[in-house]
């Protein structure tokens, strides 16, 4: 049985302030059943960046077509990047439950923010 892989191909991404950042994440299987969420940082103090089902994330959009069937691409785009957005972002797969249980995290992508060229 092949184990589910959560793949974040870029270890780091550098973006100029004011630009958009794309954080890539794909999974190797549609199962186990359960959602994908994005966080900045690790551990109990991590910040939820994107969860499609609930919450309001005005600067974050899913890269893939929301009507695409059997999607395994959970990349996101964050617009209007500021220095405050710097950090390591993790794509995390959850197993469906009550509540959902964290199953596997990607290796993380470090976002660094360059000064906007004058």
């Amino acid at each position: 049985e092949e184990e589910l892989q959560v793949i974040q191909p870029e270890k780091s991404v550098s973006v100029a302030a004011g630009d958009s950042a794309t954080l890539n994440c794909t999974v190797s299987s549609l199962i186990p059943v359960g959602p994908i969420q994005w966080f900045r940082g690790a551990g109990p103090g991590r910040e939820l960046i994107y969860n499609l089902k609930e919450g309001h994330f005005p600067r974050v959009t899913a890269v893939s077509d929301p009507t695409k069937r059997n999607n395994m691409d959970f990349s996101i785009r964050i617009s209007n990047i500021t220095p405050a957005d710097a950090g390591t972002y993790y794509c995390v797969k959850f197993r469906k439950g009550s509540p959902d249980v964290e199953l596997k995290s990607g290796a993380g992508t470090e976002l660094s923010v360059r000064a906007k060229p004058s």
Epitope: S29, L30, I31, V33, K53, D65, P66, K96
Partner: antibody
Framework: DVQLVESGGGVVRPGESLRLSCAAS????????MSWVRQAPGEGLEWVST??????YYADSVKGRFTISRDNSKNTLYLQMNSLRAEDTAVYYC???????????????WGLGTLVTVSS | EIVLTQSPATLSVSPGERVTFSCRAS??????IAWYQQKPGQAPRLLIY???SRDTGIPDRFSGSGSGTDFTLTISSLQSEDFGVYYC??????????FGGGTKVEIK
């Protein structure tokens, strides 16, 4: 082409057991969730159970009596039904789950169904 | 558990007519609704998912709309092969997946 073929239905007495099988072909069986949905005679559709990898989900009406399982090496889905009741009488459909975007599951392919009759 | 209520229970329609089916959810299900068609003695067939996306091979006379709690399936011009029972299903919050009670389309 996706094909789902159920087997194992039949007539049993209340309290007895039955094992349904669903042979799948035409898609990468091992990466999809699979489900059983039933339909009592003249009634609507009722979801029974879903399996992901080793994660399983059941309707309250069958929890503790039915067990869903899969054998990816055989591309086969199973439903072990124990302690059968008259109200379990139905056509049992095997269905392939599909997801959209980042959302939950619906059923994009269905087998023709197998009839289970529980009667004394 | 989310309850889906379909109305009407039965529709008597002539071929060529426009047909509208309603599905109402007991709570917000966003756009996580699918529609199925079932003909007598056959398995259900997926028509629409994500409230408004047609499945592969489904004729464009079938369309879906709605979000939140109120959803509609429309057949713009009913064909003879469209008679049967139509079910909606929610997949926003499960288990359990739930289906509506169905709307039967009969020949007038």
């Amino acid at each position: 082409d996706v094909q789902l073929v159920e087997s194992g239905g039949g007539v049993v007495r209340p309290g007895e057991s039955l094992r349904l099988s669903c042979a799948a072909s035409g898609f990468s069986f091992s990466i999809y969730a699979m489900s059983w949905v039933r339909q009592a005679p003249g009634e609507g559709l009722e979801w029974v159970s879903t399996i992901g990898a080793d994660d399983t989900y059941y309707a309250d009406s069958v929890k503790g009596r039915f067990t869903i399982s899969r054998d990816n090496s055989k591309n086969t889905l199973y439903l072990q039904m124990n302690s059968l009741r008259a109200e379990d009488t139905a056509v049992y459909y095997c269905a392939k789950d599909s997801t959209v975007g980042w959302s939950g599951d619906f059923f994009d392919y269905w087998g023709l169904g197998t009839l289970v009759t529980v009667s004394s | 558990e989310i309850v889906l209520t379909q109305s009407p229970a039965t529709l008597s329609v002539s071929p060529g007519e426009r047909v509208t089916f309603s599905c109402r959810a007991s709570q917000n299900v966003r756009s996580d609704i699918a529609w199925y068609q079932q003909k007598p003695g056959q398995a259900p067939r997926l028509l629409i998912y994500a409230a408004s996306s047609r499945d592969t091979g489904i004729p464009d006379r079938f369309s879906g709309s709605g979000s939140g709690t109120d959803f509609t399936l429309t057949i713009s011009s009913l064909q003879s092969e469209d008679f049967g029972v139509y079910y909606c299903q929610q997949y926003y919050d499960w288990p359990p997946f739930t289906f509506g009670g169905g709307t039967k389309v009969e020949i007038k």
